[in-house]
């Protein structure tokens, strides 16, 4: 436990301020698996990488939180970062 959380945090901390902002906006509309809720917009937009990691893990749990983070990174054109995140999660 904790490996996925660390991988999410590592990915988010490697985003520029502009990319982190874009990540949050995409997270608001990313397709979710059935029955998954959405993090409220108000809470999301002011978060830094650490707060956002904690929110993703508490809201979606580690495994799906990491998968969702990777998908948003892919939507942003950051496939390499997404792959690194998933590789770190599945070590």
């Amino acid at each position: 436990m904790g490996r996925a959380r660390d991988a999410i945090l590592d990915a988010l901390e490697n985003l520029t301020a502009e990319e982190l902002k874009k990540f949050k906006l995409k997270l608001l509309s990313v397709p979710l698996r059935e029955a998954a809720g959405r993090i409220p917009r108000g809470a999301l937009l002011s978060m830094d990488a650490l707060d956002l990691t904690d929110k993703l893990v508490s809201f979606y749990l580690e495994t799906y939180g990491a998968e969702l983070t990777a998908n948003v990174l892919r939507d942003m054109g950051l496939q390499e970062m997404a792959g690194q995140l998933q590789a770190a999660t599945h070590q």
Partner: antibody, heavy 114, light 107 residues
């Protein structure tokens, strides 16, 4: 409808270089298509931050750059051979999810011939 | 690199027929597959993204389905203007890759 502007044709000699341009925004991809063949992704560049990704197959011959002031993406193709005669498309990814190429330029036809 | 295999390579058909085009990825690409239509001497045009999302303005006779490694583009009733090359592509991993294409021709 976004229009990606590309020049129509370029005639270059073997061993020479050519610099192709594309007025675009966001992530801009470059795609090669030889006559009667499929599509090959060369690489892409993010116009807002200059971040690039390359297909290793093209890394030695293609250099992707951007001029933010004119919202223009460039690819410089060097040491050209007849195998590089093709149509080169630029394309944008503007759809928010799944990163498809939703806008395509009309393509620049590059002919390598002495 | 992820290899995208399209089949059949070509299809001869009559107007009004139902057509199924297939695309297989060499590894799991989730839903990160798009379908493009390309007419002679024209640029490719996006039809379907995210495996099943129809792009703006695309007629509803075009339907995408599948996930992971197996993907399908269905044209329920082919029109004359649908005769073209169709390419699938994945955006799950770099390098982005495309299939070799399927050509739809008139019988």
């Amino acid at each position: 409808q976004v229009q990606l502007q590309q020049p129509g044709t370029e005639l270059v000699k073997p061993g020479a270089s050519v610099k192709l341009s594309c007025r675009a925004s966001g992530w801009t991809h470059w795609v090669k298509q030889r006559p009667g063949q499929g599509l090959e992704w060369i690489g892409n560049i993010n116009l807002s931050n200059g971040r690039t990704n390359y297909n290793e197959k093209f890394r030695a011959m293609a250099t992707l750059t951007v001029d933010k002031s004119s919202s223009t993406a460039y690819t410089q193709l060097s040491s050209l051979t007849s195998e590089d005669s093709a149509v080169y498309y630029c394309a944008n990814s503007m759809v928010p999810h799944f990163f498809p190429m939703d806008y395509w330029g009309q393509g620049t036809s590059v002919t390598v011939s002495s | 690199n992820i290899v995208m295999t399209q089949y059949p390579k070509s299809m001869s058909l009559s107007i009004g027929e139902r057509v199924t085009l297939r695309c297989k990825a060499s590894e799991n690409v989730g839903s990160y597959v798009s379908w493009y239509q390309q007419k002679p001497e024209q640029s490719p045009k996006l039809l379907i993204y995210g495996a099943s999302n129809r792009y703006t303005g695309v007629p509803d006779r075009f339907t995408g389905s599948g996930s992971a490694t197996d993907f399908i583009l269905t044209i329920t009733s082919v029109q004359a203007e649908d005769l073209a090359d169709y390419h699938c592509g994945q955006s799950y991993n770099y390098p982005l890759t495309f299939g070799a294409g399927t050509k739809l021709e008139l019988k």
